[in-house]
């Protein structure tokens, strides 16, 4: 991360703002995406009854959505900065195919869906800068992603609605866990 400059010596009428630290920038970016997810979830919940479905019913899906586990080192017990940072970046890279799937799933929130996708790419860049010495980050295979996308888009309407809801819920949970973990770094 860039080193914040020292205090400005000359006295001026308007206060000077220091540049954001790498952590502040990442924090703001995650909150930006979370606010976008909230808008998308609102449209999804208004459109279908997926949001009322029990967690158990929704759990019976074959989506392999990234999820934080104890071994990832992102929880307070057993916290490990390096392991956790790798997990966050890897998880976000894995979510990208699902965010691509969301692009044609919204009517009134089309811009938000695009913004969430784009700002996730930006967040990945911010985090990769923070983790520039970590080489354990694996990028998903483009061919696998392409066939997954085709498969998801071929589902019937009900399954597509459920998939959309699950992606948004999982992504929100993943980002919230990431935000908590990053604040400890």
């Amino acid at each position: 991360a860039p080193v914040p400059p020292g205090e400005d010596s000359k006295d001026v009428a308007a206060p000077h703002r220091q540049p954001l630290t790498s952590s502040e920038r990442i924090d703001k970016q995650i909150r930006y995406i979370l606010d976008g997810i909230s808008a998308l979830r609102k449209e999804t919940c208004n459109k279908s009854n997926m949001c009322e479905s029990s967690k158990e019913a929704l759990a019976e899906n074959n989506l392999n959505l990234p999820k934080m586990a104890e071994k990832d080192g992102c929880f307070q017990s057993g916290f490990n900065e390096e392991t956790c940072l790798v997990k966050i970046i890897t998880g976000l890279l894995e979510f990208e195919v699902y965010l691509e799937y969301l692009q044609n799933r919204f009517e009134s929130s089309e811009e938000q869906a695009r913004a969430v996708q784009m700002s996730t790419k930006v967040l990945i860049q911010f985090l990769q800068k923070k983790a520039k010495n970590l080489d354990a980050i694996t990028t998903p295979d483009p061919t696998t992603n392409a066939s997954l996308l085709t498969k998801l888009q071929a589902q019937n309407q009900w399954l597509q609605d459920m998939t959309t809801h699950l992606i948004l819920r999982s992504f929100k949970e993943f980002l919230q866990s990431s935000l908590r973990a990053l604040r400890q770094m």
Epitope: P2, V3, P5, D8, A14, P15, H16, R17, Q18, P19, L20, R25, K28, Q29, R31, Y32, I33, D35, G36, S38, A39, Q112, A115, S119, V122, K129
Partner: antibody
Framework: YPQLVESGGGLVQPGGSLRLSCEAS???????MSWVRQAPGKGLEWVGS????????YYNDNVLGRFTISRDNSKNTLYLQMNSLRAEDTAVYYC?????????WGQGTLVTVSS | DIQMTQSPSSLSASVGDRVTITCRAS??????LAWYQQKPGKAPKLLIY???DRYPEVPSRFSGSGSGTDFTLTISSLQPEDFATYYC?????????FGQGTKLEIK
Amino acid sequence: YPQLVESGGGLVQPGGSLRLSCEASVLFKHQDMSWVRQAPGKGLEWVGSISPSGGSTYYNDNVLGRFTISRDNSKNTLYLQMNSLRAEDTAVYYCARDLDFMDEWGQGTLVTVSS
Amino acid sequence: DIQMTQSPSSLSASVGDRVTITCRASQGISNYLAWYQQKPGKAPKLLIYDGDDRYPEVPSRFSGSGSGTDFTLTISSLQPEDFATYYCQQYYSTPYTFGQGTKLEIK
């Protein structure tokens, strides 16, 4: 994808006032925001910025005391109140998300100060 | 205030050319520098931040370099859509300041 939409521009006499609005999508609620202006045929000039809560504002010296930036997060709207306008304030005014650099911009609204 | 000086102020080039635009700060700004592209009647678009980080979906032909006071934006092989005005901006301290712009025209 227009996430930021400015309005309120127009023709105003020197010494007059105008309030610009920037309607933002919900994504901007927790973001620092800036106003940047561009005089016709000229370069970009930062006007000022505001923190997410609206508690901190920063201004360029040439608008300090005349312009006020505020926001209403319940309406997802950013404002620029411009008083004591001068001919040199004639410009297209843009609102932008401010991560120190500006990564999302509105389409701009033209303010003309002339008698 | 930190002054940002861009050169050249205008430049004629052909499709396929390699083009370099420079930006000089009146004092050291570490790598707190961004580059924007602006087309007539449109808002600026972010290309590069932190001196050399390409914003997502910006074509790889655009690259930034430099630190301290001297920075460059390079377009490795000009495409027809690259003819526009380019601005640098420092964010080391407020007031944020921009270069005066470089207008890139077709030769």
